[in-house]
């Protein structure tokens, strides 16, 4: 396993909508045909797994259909979308890059992103 | 280094409008927030809110909202606060801040606007 | 939104004594997105501990940060001269961030 450096920025604040996009990239030190990148989120000292997706290089990312997440590719930069966020999940979102195939296999983990997420004020009642 | 310079003390009259600049430099602008922090003579620090110059989105503080605006120029990796319809209790010492991860890692040097008739 | 509260309001002490300011939080707040600030008059504030406990670079080792949850504290542990200024905590965990009312620390 070889260690490679992956940059995301350091503090992202989500939309009103509770949507979240930031790149992450890699400095990739081969030709990488297959990579697979996941989103880990960082809370209270609990790391868990958000989503995760393979894909080969110039082709779209995949997720599941249940993903919250979203993403395009673009050559070592991996665009990321992660929707549906409430302010419950506000926390340090650490995006982690595989290069899979070929051989030897390479890890990057960055440093991670802030994401900050604000609930939408409720909207008053209306007579309509 | 690491900096953020303010543009220079202001005095404006009740129920005009003030912009206040931060110009960072020796970082990446977009990888981070700014903040904007204002202290009134002899008082706390309280937080008017903050953008996010990845994206360009902004939280503002509840009293504040309606008559602030946050902005950036990633092309010149600068922050704005305008501050409109003001009151003399908005006589302060305005602070530019970086949100890092965890805090405000890098401040200013304050802005002193003076609203008075 | 979370409230931070500071006490004391004022610490009165002698060149070489401890200092040790509490932080109260209205709710739970993790550690890491607790702060602490330094002012002093005509000055921006500066960071000295984020994390709850990890001091800012070239902050000297007599400032430290512990605490968890809802209650916070700075400890100076032999003031200087130049530490006597006034003392912030804010928390960064919840949008609004705040910031305590702050604790001077002045010449006995």
């Known amino acids: 396993c070889k260690a490679m450096h992956v940059a995301q920025p350091a503090v992202v604040l989500a939309s009103s909508r509770g949507i979240a996009s930031f790149v992450c990239e890699y400095a990739s030190p081969g030709k990488a045909t297959e990579v697979r990148v996941t989103v880990l989120r960082q809370a209270d000292s609990q790391v868990t797994e958000v989503c995760a997706a393979t894909y080969m290089m110039g082709n779209e990312l995949t997720f599941l259909d249940d993903s919250i997440c979203t993403g395009t590719s673009s050559g070592n930069q991996v665009n990321l979308t992660i929707q549906g966020l409430r302010a419950m999940d506000t926390g340090l979102y650490i995006c982690k890059v595989e290069l899979m195939y070929p051989p030897p296999y390479y890890l990057g983990i960055g440093n991670g992103t802030q994401i900050y997420v604000i609930d939408p004020e409720p909207c008053p009642d209306s007579d309509f | 280094q690491v900096q953020l310079v303010q543009s220079g003390a202001e005095v404006k009259k009740p129920g005009a409008s003030v912009k206040v600049s931060c110009k960072a430099s020796g970082y990446t602008f977009t990888s981070y927030g700014i903040s904007w922090v204002r202290q009134a003579p002899g008082q706390g620090l309280e937080c008017m809110g903050w953008i996010s110059a990845y994206n360009g989105n902004t939280n503002y503080a509840q009293k504040l909202q309606g008559r602030v605006t946050m902005t950036t120029d990633t092309s010149t990796s600068t922050a704005y606060m305008e501050l409109r319809s003001l009151r003399s209790d908005d006589t302060a010492v305005y602070y530019c801040?970086?949100?890092?991860?965890?805090?405000?890692?890098?401040w200013g040097q304050g802005t002193m606007v003076t609203v008075s008739s | 939104e979370i409230v931070m509260t500071q006490s004391p309001a004022t610490l009165s002490l002698s060149p070489g004594e401890r200092a040790t300011l509490s932080c109260r939080a209205s709710q739970s707040v993790s550690s890491s997105y607790l702060s602490w600030y330094q002012q002093k008059p005509g000055q921006a504030p500066r960071l000295l501990i984020y994390g709850a406990s990890t001091r800012a670079t070239g902050i000297p080792a007599r400032f430290s940060g512990s605490g968890s949850e809802t209650d916070f504290t700075l400890t100076i542990s032999s003031l200087q001269p130049e530490d006597f200024a006034v003392y912030y905590c804010?928390?960064?965990?919840?949008?609004?961030?705040?910031f305590g009312p702050g604790t001077k620390v002045d010449i006995k």
């Open positions: 804010q928390q960064v965990y919840n949008l609004p961030f705040t």
């Open positions: 801040a970086r949100v890092g991860i965890g805090a405000f890692d890098i």
